[in-house]
Interface confidence: low
């Protein structure tokens, strides 16, 4: 704000990210043949006009005219924060103050607490922590594109007394759809200027198998070769497949991995077939009705858990 007093210098508050460069600009309308001076929060003179007063190579002269003194401070540290004073040695001495705020950059977050091989419907609890922010950063969670509601960010002062460590926890019940999902903790802070700073944890979920029977070809005829593929899914993937035909004993032999093969279809092959896929998480039986009299088999929609 330009005062009615033309010899009153003016400046502005500045915000800078730690490690960055800040320019301090001081202007005066009527210098009364006096030089402008910048001093730091410890009241050490930095520049008097174009003359360097403090041996600090980070501090450089940007502009020195009778009406302006601008200096730059590079590689700014948290300790540089405070009120910088621009003075003009008129009678009386007039001063203007610039509050330099140094933002501490939050470190990449760290996720802890993940327990491998969660079972479906169990609760996953993850913790996220980031140090070094000033002011205190905020943490957010997401699972893929879905936002997760973690607890309120907790704030703790770092040992340096200037920056903060923030932490947050999130808990959620896992489903089979979460197998292989990435849980992401992101740190939000004005020093990042919108840049993404996040850490992800891929989770594994163990769940019971499912299966479906797929005929090949899709529409077999009498006399053709037919394969009934039993396609099992689950985590872990089913390792054991057992075929049965309703009304027949004992279980049928597979001739190709999990598939049941009919080298030459005839009417006696008609009937309902079941495939039981088993993992150490459980079993699932899928059914398929084959009617060789018809031009094509008709799959049934029924399936049974065991």
């Amino acid at each position: 704000n330009l005062s009615q007093d033309d010899s009153q210098p003016w400046t502005s508050d500045e915000t800078v990210v730690a490690g960055g460069t800040v320019v301090l600009k001081c202007q005066v309308k009527d210098h009364e043949d006096s030089s402008l001076q910048w001093s730091n929060p410890a009241q050490q003179t930095l520049y008097f006009g174009e003359k360097r007063a403090l041996r600090d190579n980070r501090i450089q002269l940007v502009s020195s005219t009778p009406h302006e003194l601008s200096i730059s401070i590079s590689n700014v540290a948290l300790a540089d924060e405070g009120e910088y004073t621009c003075s003009i040695f008129t009678m009386p001495v007039r001063t203007a103050k610039s509050l330099v705020t140094v933002l501490g950059i939050p470190q990449k977050p760290i996720i802890t607490g993940y327990k491998s091989s969660l079972r479906e419907k169990e609760t996953a609890t993850l913790n996220c922590q980031s140090s070094g922010s000033k002011p205190a950063a905020q943490l957010t969670w997401r699972k893929g594109d879905q936002e997760l509601h973690g607890d309120q960010t907790r704030i703790q002062e770092d040992p340096n007394g200037k920056t903060f460590t923030v932490s947050s926890s999130v808990s959620f019940q896992v489903t089979r759809e979460d197998d292989g999902a990435n849980i992401v903790c992101s740190v939000n802070h004005e020093s990042l200027k919108g840049a993404d700073r996040s850490t992800s944890q891929r989770i594994e979920v163990l769940y019971t198998p499912t299966a479906m029977i797929r005929p090949e070809p899709a529409h077999p005829r009498e006399g053709q070769k037919l394969l009934l593929h039993c396609e099992g899914r689950g985590n872990p993937v089913p390792q054991q497949y057992v075929w049965v035909k309703e009304g027949s004993e004992p279980p049928l032999k597979m001739t190709q991995e999990s598939a049941l093969i009919f080298p030459f279809l005839n009417k006696s092959d008609s009937g309902t077939y079941g495939c039981t896929a088993t993992s150490n998480m459980g079993s699932y039986t899928a059914y398929f009705t084959l009617n060789v009299n018809d031009p094509s088999p008709v799959p049934s929609s029924s399936s049974t858990y065991h």
Epitope: D13, T15, L99, T101, P135, A136, I155, E157
Partner: nanobody, 124 residues
Framework: QVQLVQSGGGLVQPGGSLRLSCAAS????????RGWFRQAPGKGREFVAA????????NYADSAKGRFTISRDNSKNTLYLQMNSLRAEDTAVYYC?????????????????WGQGTLVTVSS
């Protein structure tokens, strides 16, 4: 721009307690300091208490020390002043304020945004 809306004033007997609230909207509340000032009838505005953005640093006027507590809840964007052991000389219009810098300021000139004021009357 910051808007500050105050609540919680009223009439209280000497020795009683009151809690003032100040809800902020606009610019991110948590990044900036906040202060409480008061103005007694016929007097100038005087500093009561201030708190920095994290709540870790507070400062009190001598008249408020030991009786008043300033606090903030950044999740609710709200500043509080808990006033205990109230005296007749605490009667004043109380204002919450926000400066444009990220450090607490103890001088009214350092504040840019002000609440509407709330009257606290201490009388038997």
């Amino acid at each position: 721009q910051v808007q500050l809306v105050q609540s919680g004033g009223g009439l209280v007997q000497p020795g009683g307690s009151l809690r003032l609230s100040c809800a902020a909207s606009g610019r991110t509340f948590s990044n900036y300091a906040r202060g409480w000032f008061r103005q007694a009838p016929g007097k100038g505005r005087e500093f009561v208490a201030a708190i920095d953005y994290s709540g870790g640093s507070t400062n009190y006027a001598d008249s408020a020390k030991g009786r008043f507590t300033i606090s903030r809840d950044n999740s609710k964007n709200t500043l509080y002043l808990q006033m205990n052991s109230l005296r007749a000389e605490d009667t004043a219009v109380y204002y919450c304020a926000a400066p444009a810098s990220r450090r607490p300021s103890w001088d009214a000139d350092g504040y840019d945004y002000w609440g509407q004021g709330t009257l606290v009357t201490v009388s038997s």
